[in-house]
């Protein structure tokens, strides 16, 4: 139900990345607008992106006050220029969204490698602890600190002149591994958090090769 | 509940090939690594490779690398494993198993097995 | 490759036994080792992971530990349904390698 010139927002969407959070929702208004609720299951709904025309809305803010709860959203749909205008029940028109657990469904962005050093037949490898939004004392959490040992990095490393991919994995953001010694090894990383059934892994990083300008080699 | 099933095991002449099939139900592979592991009869076991769905990323024992490749196909959910250049040392049950972790190697799910029979 | 070395082949126990099988790799594998059981005719299941960690499902009775580059699988109270091939597997580097397997039978 509703007035006849508004229309219930749907395919309400949760996109988000290491935190980063966005609702989408369609259609694209035609002489509507739009303004969205957040609330974890026993709290109060809290309005955000008042009166407005786009068809998404960032809820990043609310989400990383607490990643481990289950949040639900809720989108009103008003008439352009009377917002004050309700449904035929007396309410705005309004559609909920999936609920949504950023801790367990936020997917894990792309990782870059930071570094490597070869020493001899060992490369170190080193993953850049990526920084989110979700905040403590007023500093940035990195995606370590927020999932602590749940995350681990799987490494691929393959000779420049062969196609197999070796593999390693860490709980830290660090791999010693051992390779042939003059050869040219590249690599490619994944986080992946184990015990997810969904959204696992994330992309892989950018392919990083030894004899290029991010890595140091040192022959002991 | 997840699920790993093989098929197209079978007779075949040394030299000869086969595809064996490993659908998978009630997880998606992209999330996660499959494996080949195989048996000979009264054996113990043998990994054979490692696909990871997600980036079509391989690797392959050295006793069947070049004769055997390993794909996926993430529309059907389904890995596959291409037996080239098939030698009597290769008869076994063939299995496909999800990785627990990333691509650590850990085999939290099995299928029930094909068996491979390479014989003239 | 790394070899898993694992001892005895075969063991022969009673129900209620308290069991032990070994797991020697030729180089460090940190706690990179899993245990699984086989049936005669079925697929192995696992049993433990990285190296002490009952899987989910697993009786309490089965334990895994690490020793340096040694490993063992322990069950404590053999039951009837134990009867079975045991291998342990090393996935600290690609590619992962098996025990050659322990077979327990019934005294």
């Known amino acids: 139900s509703g007035t006849t010139n508004t229309v219930a927002a749907y395919n309400l969407t949760w996109k988000s990345t290491n935190f980063k959070t966005i609702l989408e929702w369609e259609p694209k208004p035609v002489n509507q607008v739009y303004t969205v609720q957040i609330s974890t299951k026993s709290g109060d709904w809290k309005s955000k992106c008042f009166y407005t025309t786009d068809t998404e809305c960032d809820l990043t803010d609310e989400i990383v006050k607490d990643v481990k709860q289950t949040y639900l959203a809720r989108v009103f749909s008003y008439p352009a220029g009377n917002v004050e205008s309700t449904g035929s029940a007396g309410e705005p028109l309004y559609e909920n969204s999936p609920e949504f657990t950023p801790y367990l469904e936020t997917n894990l962005g792309q990782p870059t490698i930071q570094s490597f050093e070869q020493v001899g037949t060992k490369v170190n490898v080193t993953v850049e602890d990526e920084r989110t939004l979700v905040r403590r004392n007023n500093t940035f959490l990195s995606l370590r600190d927020v999932f602590g040992k749940d995350l681990i990095y799987t490494l691929y490393y393959w000779k420049s002149s062969s196609s197999g991919k070796k593999t390693a994995k860490t709980n830290t953001n660090e791999f010693l591994i051992d390779v042939d010694k003059g050869e040219n090894y590249c690599f490619s990383v994944q986080a992946v958090i184990p015990s997810r059934t969904v959204n696992r892994k994330s992309t892989d990083s950018p392919v990083e090769c030894m004899g290029q300008e991010k890595g140091e080699f040192r022959e002991i | 509940e997840v699920q790993l099933v093989e098929s197209g095991g079978g007779l075949v002449q040394p030299g000869g090939s086969l595809r064996l099939s490993c659908a998978a139900s009630?997880?998606?592979?992209?999330?996660?690594?499959i494996h080949w592991v195989r048996q000979a009869p009264g054996k113990g076991l043998e990994w054979v490779g490692y696909?990871?769905?997600?980036?079509?990323?391989?690797y392959y024992a050295d006793s069947v690398k070049g004769r055997f490749t390993i794909s996926a196909d993430t529309s059907k959910n389904t890995a596959y494993l291409q037996t080239n250049s098939l030698r009597a040392e290769d008869t076994a049950v063939y299995y496909c198993?999800?990785?627990?972790?990333?691509?650590?190697?850990?085999?939290?799910?099995w299928g029930q097995g094909t068996l491979v029979t390479v014989s003239s | 490759d790394i070899q898993m070395t694992q001892s005895p082949s075969s063991l022969s126990a009673s129900v209620g036994d308290r069991v032990t099988i070994t797991c020697r790799a030729s180089q460090d594998v940190n706690t990179a080792v899993a245990w699984y059981q086989q049936k005669p005719g079925k697929a192995p299941k696992l049993l433990i992971y990285?190296?002490?960690f009952l899987y989910s499902g697993v009786p309490s009775r089965f334990s895994g530990s690490r020793s340096g580059t040694d490993f063992t699988l322990t069950i404590s109270s053999l039951q009837p349904e134990d009867f079975a091939t045991y291998y342990c597997?090393?996935?600290?580097?690609?590619?992962?390698?098996f025990g050659q397997g322990t077979k327990v039978e019934i005294k």
């Open positions: 198993a999800r990785d627990i972790q990333s691509v650590s190697g850990e085999f939290d799910y």
């Open positions: 990285s190296a002490s």
């Open positions: 009630g997880f998606t592979i992209s999330d996660y690594v």
């Open positions: 696909i990871d769905p997600s980036n079509g990323f391989t």
């Open positions: 597997q090393q996935h600290y580097t690609t590619p992962p390698t």
